[in-house]
Interface confidence: low
Amino acid sequence: VPRWRQQWSGPGTTKRFPETVLARCVKYTEIHPEMRHVDCQSVWDAFKGAFISKHPCNITEEDYQPLMKLGTQTVPCNKILLWSRIKDLAHQFTQVQRDMFTLEDTLLGYLADDLTWCGEFNTSKINYQSCPDWRKDCSNNPVSVFWKTVSRRFAEAACDVVHVMLNGSRSKIFDKNSTFGSVEVHNLQPEKVQTLEAWVIHGGREDSRDLCQDPTIKELESIISKRNIQFSCKNIYRPDKFLQCVKNPEDSSCTSEI
């Protein structure tokens, strides 16, 4: 008789989730010599311990503390790039500009990027059928709590000038409900962070508007200013050229405004 299983609204745990996490950990620790001391089996055990046998709507930041401790990593606090709704370009940028880091360039962010996971209350099984959806089911689910936890820690670590890449093609360029808007903005430390510089990425080639004047950007500026952090904003009209010029800054076409 098949055991009754809670049906959630979101997709289930990513196929081969344990292998993926362990393999990513092993790969990351080899590529990043400063993290070679990390025992990936312990990392997986801590990751698993955060959600296995627990109700997937009752996960807390505390559940992830053993994993956070094992994944403690120092990144240059003045080289942090946050992003909202434009992950791919942000990652392409840090692949070229190797001294800057998104959350997914850190061990814990790299482990979980694009993955879904959840368990079931009182069983040691991983749920591959469905997991809670943030809106339709509950916000305290394993994936949402993980990203809230690591995003908060990442923002808290930032200093000097912090950059954020925002998607100018969206109706809300700055969205208060995004992880950036709801977590990271509020956890930048004013005593350490001097400026938040927003890069608004334009989608269309013909779009020459100044999206830094968008009402949602003004809202972001207001929130940041109230936190005693300076705000600046730049339009990136041609993201393809922007990346090209990051790769080849000596290129003559890169001396003009990008």
Epitope: R16, P18, E19, L22, A23, V26, K27, E30, I31, Q41, W44, K125, I126, Y128
Partner: antibody
Framework: QVQLVQSGAEVKKPGSSVKVSCKAS????????INWVRQAPGQGLEWMGE????????HYAQKFQGRVTITADESTSTAYMELSSLRSEDTAVYYC??????????????????WGQGTLVTVSS | EIVMTQSPATLSVSPGERATLSCRAS??????LAWYQQKPGQAPRLLIY???TRATGIPARFSGSGSGTEFTLTISSLQSEDFAVYYC?????????FGQGTKVEIK
Amino acid sequence: QVQLVQSGAEVKKPGSSVKVSCKASGGQFSFYAINWVRQAPGQGLEWMGEIIPDYGVTHYAQKFQGRVTITADESTSTAYMELSSLRSEDTAVYYCARWSYTYGIRYYYKLFDPWGQGTLVTVSS
Amino acid sequence: EIVMTQSPATLSVSPGERATLSCRASQSVSSNLAWYQQKPGQAPRLLIYGASTRATGIPARFSGSGSGTEFTLTISSLQSEDFAVYYCQQYNNWPWTFGQGTKVEIK
């Protein structure tokens, strides 16, 4: 250092079943997949299937689908391979092998390592 | 399923000589290929994974190359303990499949 120790040789009648065990010692059992590979006398290696004990997922080669059942007992770090409806062509040495990940600078790899010592199953009337 | 074809079936080589074994996949397996050595009465032993990376403890005289569908295992100078059967295996797609083996024998 993980070692895989298999159960002893078996002689079985056609039509019956055999259950071979593979016990892991000296390392983490549940995460890694345990594979079963067989080798008929004088023949090559033939992959039968695998189990990932951590979440009970099994994959079987089509040739053995319906006849082979791979299970695992995490409490004893033991995997089992049961083959039913035995025929003389099933006479072979049955190996278990663990796959795990290792890594390079740009890639990570799946390895079949280590292997059990093998279990000879003879099917004869 | 992916069919792995090894050649030759038997290779006769004198000790100290070079041995070159081939393995062809019926479709691309990227670099997801391993080589094993098997001696009579023993379980296979992993030599090479990722097409070209030597497993722990494997002597430098063993080297692997290739990607996609064509792969080669080279033993630069055969020692007496190298006479055995060698198998290639792809782990790119289920089901994992092995070649039929190449027997390296003393000439």
